[in-house]
């Protein structure tokens, strides 16, 4: 029972985590304009992995995609790659873990196969979570570096006569979503690996014992019994539960004259 709970919880936590990683990857607010100690502008800038956006006081928001691959910073490309790898591994991990769930019976799949699949999905979730955390952390580091660089030359211009305000960017909501989601996926993966230990069949080998019956000398050598131990729980009278499918669950806008997005 404890194994099923651990496995199920690991699956759900990973599912939420991967959904979060997908959401973070798609979000536009990876970096947002720093409003602290900045001249009050009527324009708010924010950037994602795929496009940059500008929201005016009027509420009109204009987003422009990065329609170049070669022109983008290598770090941004690396972050994109890490997040995509995280999503792909997580998605495969989810697919594998569905079949590995103890509460779902698929033909005559043995516990050893389920244990292997659980371990595989667990490792995938761990790597997926690490990819997401790494991606978000690389981006955050890039932001911190750029922030202090732009602070050093906040105002540039000809002898200070004409000033150009340099937009500084700080952490956006997507970073926090990514960190939390990556962490959840990682935790889910660890839980799956722990559940795998409980699912793994243990070969119990008994030494040969001689039974002396009247007049007959019979040597009885039992084979290795398959013991499905759920953390020491008695699983002699196993009940298979067919679990039902679980489902997880400002702004002023200016009437558009043009489509910019």
């Amino acid at each position: 029972m404890a194994v099923t709970a651990c496995q199920g919880l690991g699956f759900v936590v990973s599912l939420i985590g991967i959904a979060g990683i997908i959401a973070a990857t798609c979000m536009d607010q990876w970096s947002t304009q720093d409003l602290y100690n900045n001249p009050v502008t009527a324009v708010f800038n924010y950037q994602g992995l795929w496009r940059s956006c500008v929201r005016e006081s009027s509420g009109f928001t204009e987003c422009r995609g990065y329609f170049t691959l070669l022109g983008l910073p290598a770090m941004l490309q690396a972050v994109r790659a890490l997040m995509i790898v995280g999503i792909v591994l997580g998605a495969i991990g989810l697919l594998v873990s569905i079949f590995a769930l103890k509460c779902i019976r698929i033909g005559s799949m043995e516990d050893s196969a389920k244990a292997n699949m659980t371990l595989t999905s667990g490792i995938m979730f761990i790597v997926s979570g690490l990819c997401a955390i790494a991606g978000v952390s690389v981006f955050a580091n890039m932001l911190v570096t750029n922030f202090w660089m732009s602070t050093a030359n906040m105002y540039t211009g000809m002898g200070g006569m004409v000033q150009t305000v340099q937009t500084r960017y700080t952490f956006g909501a997507a970073l926090f979503v990514g960190w939390v989601a990556g962490g959840l996926t990682l935790i889910g993966g660890v839980m799956m690996c722990i559940a795998c230990r409980g699912l793994a069949p243990e070969e119990t080998n008994y030494k040969a014992v001689s039974y002396h019956a009247s007049g007959h000398s019979v040597a009885y050598k039992p084979g290795g019994f398959k013991a499905s131990t759920g953390f020491g729980s008695n699983t002699k009278n196993k009940k298979i539960y067919d679990g039902g499918a679980r489902t997880e669950d400002e702004v002023q806008s200016y009437p558009s004259k043009h489509d910019y997005v």
Epitope: P39, T41, V43, N45, V251, Q252, S253
Partner: antibody, heavy 118, light 113 residues
Amino acid sequence: QVQLVQSGSELKKPGESVKVSCKASGYTFTNYGMNWVRQAPGQGLEWMGWINTYTGESTYADGFTGRFVFSMDTSASTAYLQISSLKAEDMAMYFCATLGYGNSLAYWGQGTLVTVSS
Amino acid sequence: DIVMTQSPDSLAVSLGERATINCKSSQSLLNSGNQRNYLTWYQQKPGQPPKLLIYWASTRESGVPDRFSGSGSGTDFTLTISSLQAEDVAVYYCQNNYFYPFTFGQGTKLEIK
């Protein structure tokens, strides 16, 4: 089409208060922020500030804090400008205007002349 | 506050001729996020409210004749009327729409020579 209709001219004494209204029609009132602009006789335009008609939050230009208050009635699609403790220098034409693309003032009311005379 | 300086204060141009009004801001109005300049041009005729001509420094408002064009970037901007018509006699204002407060230029009075 978008229309902003302002209240009629006002003649006030120094120290009194005045409330200028700006009724919007032809669009969803909360979709456009409402700006207020002052123009003294024979002078240029002076941006007073704006009210976010979605949140009700107001932003005032430096010389227009304290005696000047922007408000609105969403149900009536009307924005208001209230000036208290009127002074002679407050005598001007007051315009309301909606925020458009590029934070420009896209549509303007016809203006309300506020005369301050003892 | 951002200071918007228009030049000249008044301008007399013959009908059919080109009229050019300049506007200079004390800080750049270029937003790096979308590479747009937050400068707007208005036309005000006597006894009327101002009328929006150009926003984002160069985008003409719908219904505005194409003889009106805006150019410039950063701190220096220009409004050009390619062929002056009698109905173009008015006062023209530029406005900063990037920094609060949204300051206006002092205005340029355009007359027919």
